[in-house]
């Protein structure tokens, strides 16, 4: 069948990398600088991608593959391709579909990607709370309250944080 | 913040040229293509071309290839957009606009009058 | 050219409705949609990115969504300041393509 098709049709035997060329006879010619064609038995070759301005090349065009794109610090890629660049989230906030939103109480982000984490459940290692859980810092547990016998060395509690939150207990 | 501040309104007689700033705060200026826009009285929103400061590279709207001429100064975080043997029907608010794929920052408009 | 075609034109509304704009490409635009607003000073702002991104500081009144050729914008419940021209735009291909834009007026 392929030997069939190839009869048919010249252009199928043009790989990647070529092009059709309907002006020379259907020959396969290279395809010209800053284009490219992924697959064989194309009539024509598609212009490279260029990757400008927010965009910044992640990996060359080539013959046979288009270029790709990702975006400058603090951007993030957005659809197919990395058709569009986002602005990274701050701290205390995580990337959702509809952009960047603040962390819920009780959760915490200490990084500008990702996703806001539950505060640490100090009560389950049988802690208590330290310092106070907020949107970009996690709690602090410190040692149990049993510890904290007669006599033993005390713990000053730390002055209340800018947003007092509080382990989920 | 962000900002993007265009020259003032200018009127120019049919045939002429007219030169418009778009002086760019708060950002990289480097950084970001630049995109012009159109919008004709009581019309919609018309893309002109695009330039990418840091190496000049310009991308044209066919129908202002050879009209329109796109610059930029880095040293002062301005673009520049000039348009050529004018017509009544160029007579339109012109807006510079910061590019992420999306046009998230804009200029005010410059209004342009052609007009004899 | 990706054709970019905005329905209604323009359409009369109360405070409290809930509005939705459609827009529909000539192609498959890869949700590559943006949404902006113009008042009637002339000023320019971008509402939604990527069909559905919200941008920072716009209500969460308005939404985004859609696929393909057919996207939608929608104001939950229109508010006084809302009163405006709304314009969708394709990023999927140079040029750079607007709808032809609706205008939300009070009834």
């Known amino acids: 069948f392929e030997r069939t098709r190839s009869l048919q049709d010249p252009c199928s035997n043009c790989p990647a990398g070529t092009f059709c060329d309907n002006n020379r006879n259907q020959i396969c010619s290279p395809c010209p600088p800053n284009s490219f064609s992924s697959a064989g038995g194309q009539r024509t070759c598609d212009i490279c991608r260029q990757c400008k301005g927010v965009f910044r090349t992640r990996k060359e065009c080539s013959s046979t593959s288009n270029a790709e794109c990702d975006c400058t610090p603090g951007f993030h890629c957005l659809g197919a391709g990395c058709s569009m660049c986002e602005q990274d989230c701050k701290q205390g906030q995580e990337l959702t579909k509809k952009g960047c939103k603040d962390c819920c109480f009780g959760t915490f982000n200490d990084q500008k990607r990702g996703i806001c984490r539950p505060w640490t459940n100090c009560s389950l290692d049988g802690k208590s709370v330290l310092v106070n859980g907020t949107k970009e810092r996690d709690v602090v547990c410190g040692p149990s309250p049993a510890d904290l016998s007669p006599g033993a060395s005390s713990v000053t509690p730390p002055a209340p944080a800018r947003e007092p939150g509080h382990s989920p207990q | 913040q962000v900002q993007l501040v265009q020259s003032g309104a200018e009127v120019v007689k049919p045939g002429a040229s007219v030169k418009l700033s778009c002086k760019a705060s708060?950002?990289?200026?480097?950084?970001?293509?630049m995109h012009w826009i159109r919008q004709a009285p009581g019309q919609g929103l018309g893309w002109i071309g695009a330039?990418?400061?840091?190496?000049?590279?310009?991308d044209y709207n066919q129908k202002f290839k050879d009209r329109a001429t796109l610059t930029a100064d880095t040293s002062i975080s301005t673009a520049y957009m000039e348009l050529s043997r004018l017509r009544s029907d160029d007579t339109a608010v012109y807006y510079c606009?910061?590019?992420?794929?999306?046009?998230?920052?804009w200029g005010q408009g410059t209004l342009v009058t052609v007009s004899s | 050219d990706i054709q970019m075609t905005q329905s209604p034109s323009s359409l009369s509304a109360s405070v409290g409705d809930r509005v939705t704009i459609t827009c529909r490409a000539s192609?498959?635009?890869?949700?590559?949609l943006n949404w902006y607003q113009q008042k009637p000073g002339g000023a320019v702002k971008l509402l939604i990115y990527?069909?559905?991104r919200l941008h920072s500081g716009v209500p969460s009144r308005f939404s985004g969504s859609g696929s393909g050729t057919d996207y939608t914008l929608t104001i939950s419940s229109l508010q006084p300041e809302d009163f405006a021209t709304y314009f969708c735009?394709?990023?999927?291909?140079?040029?750079?393509?607007f709808g032809g834009g609706t205008k939300v007026e009070i009834r």
């Open positions: 192609q498959d635009i890869r949700s590559n």
């Open positions: 708060g950002y990289t200026f480097a950084g970001f293509e």
């Open positions: 606009t910061r590019d992420l794929g999306y046009f998230d920052v």
């Open positions: 330039i990418d400061p840091k190496t000049g590279g310009t």
């Open positions: 735009q394709q990023s999927e291909k140079l040029p750079r393509t």
């Open positions: 990527y069909t559905s």
